[in-house]
């Protein structure tokens, strides 16, 4: 069977530029090592936002300078992207790869449209 990945269609970032969503995958095999990548698609260009490889049952570890954090529970990954601004509004795709043990499987979600609205600056108080 091919691997299916589900993620919400739309998420609104908080006023602090933080967006969270769940990426859930239907694993066809008993993977012990999983790689999760967040991709951003804009104007048909796809770029990598962040990636993490984790052992099942352990925490997701993104690079120290990553704008992503996450936790895993079974076949669910809870992803949080920080530091978002209005210009970062776009389609964020969850990509899941079952790396080990073989066989390798790829799963790509349909994407979550994240809307980011920059907060209005506070008016000067006299």
């Amino acid at each position: 069977k091919a691997m299916h990945v589900a993620q919400p269609a739309v998420v609104l970032a908080s006023s602090r530029g933080i967006a969270s969503f769940v990426c859930e995958y239907a694993s066809p095999g008993k993977a012990t090592e999983v790689r999760v990548t967040v991709l951003r698609q804009a104007d048909s260009q796809v770029t990598e936002v962040c990636a993490a490889t984790y052992m099942m049952g352990n925490e997701l570890t993104f690079l120290d300078d990553s704008i992503c954090t996450g936790t895993s529970s079974g076949n669910q990954v809870n992803l949080t992207i920080q530091g978002l601004r209005a210009m970062d509004t776009g389609l964020y795709i969850c990509k899941v790869e079952l790396m080990y043990p073989p066989p390798y499987y790829l799963g790509i979600g349909n994407g979550t449209q994240i809307y980011v609205i920059d907060p209005e600056p506070c008016p000067d108080s006299d």
């Epitope: 069977k1 091919a2 691997m3 990598e48 990509k95 499987y105 790829l106």
Partner: antibody, heavy 118, light 107 residues
Framework: EVQLVESGGGVVEPGRSLRLSCAAS????????MHWVRQAPGKGLEWVAV????????DYADSAKGRFTISRDNSKNTLYLQMNSLRAEDTAVYYC???????????WGQGTLVTVSS | EIVLTQSPGTLSLSPGERATLSCRAS??????LAWYQQKPGQAPRPLIY???SRATGIPDRFSGSGSGTDFTLTISRLEPEDFAVYYC?????????FGPGTKVDIK
């Protein structure tokens, strides 16, 4: 600009070895899975091997298992295919290809011809 | 192993005509299907990925459709440069497999 350039092909006798190289440029090499695909003269495309983000994670086609070894040197942005115990049926053009962010093979090298003949 | 079957083996058409190429998988591959074009002496060139998304720089006369196990590549109006061999590929699981190809030649 993404570029993949294969080298190392040539004529070799059955049972001998050959090492192919693929020099990559224009992208962050270590962030991508890299593949070898071959094409026998007048035939279709056959996937040979892949090496993932960790150099220890590899997969091979049945026809390559036990004889071919894929490796990468991220510091040199280079992909390799060590081919041992070569047979006449290994005669083909060997392409390296990048596994794109969305999974399909988005960039290919120009290929290098390997001829196994006595 | 997922086996891909392409039909027809050869398609003889004239420039300006519509080409319809078929690819069938031995089991469901969701949307992890790509199409490549190859001309003699050249490397394959990606045309379509994810069943229906065009790769960078591919003209809109190329389109892909299908789901599950049955997929189609359509070239709405053949241009002289479109006469080539077309391969489908599944990339959703190991081992990655290609179809045997369909040759589109000039009638």
């Amino acid at each position: 600009e993404v570029q993949l350039v294969e080298s190392g092909g040539g004529v070799v006798e059955p049972g001998r070895s050959l090492r192919l190289s693929c020099a990559a440029s224009g992208f962050t090499f270590s962030s991508y899975g890299m593949h070898w695909v071959r094409q026998a003269p007048g035939k279709g495309l056959e996937w040979v091997a892949v090496i993932w983000y960790k150099p220890s994670e590899k997969d091979y086609a049945d026809s390559a298992k036990g004889r071919f070894t894929i490796s990468r040197d991220n510091s040199k942005n280079t992909l390799y295919l060590q081919m041992n115990s070569l047979r006449a049926e290994d005669t083909a053009v060997y392409y390296c290809a990048r596994g794109g962010l969305l999974g399909y093979f988005d960039y290919w090298g120009q290929g290098t011809l390997v001829t196994v003949s006595s | 192993e997922i086996v891909l079957t392409q039909s027809p083996g050869t398609l003889s058409l004239s420039p300006g005509e519509r080409a319809t190429l078929s690819c069938r998988a031995s089991q469901s591959i969701n949307s992890y299907l790509a199409w490549y074009q190859q001309k003699p002496g050249q490397a394959p060139r990606p045309l379509i990925y994810g069943v229906s998304s065009r790769a960078t720089g591919i003209p809109d006369r190329f389109s892909g459709s299908g789901s599950g196990t049955d997929f189609t590549l359509t070239i709405s109006r053949l241009e002289p440069e479109d006469f080539a061999v077309y391969y489908c590929q599944q990339y959703g699981r190991y081992p990655f497999t290609f179809g045997p190809g369909t040759k589109v030649d000039i009638k």
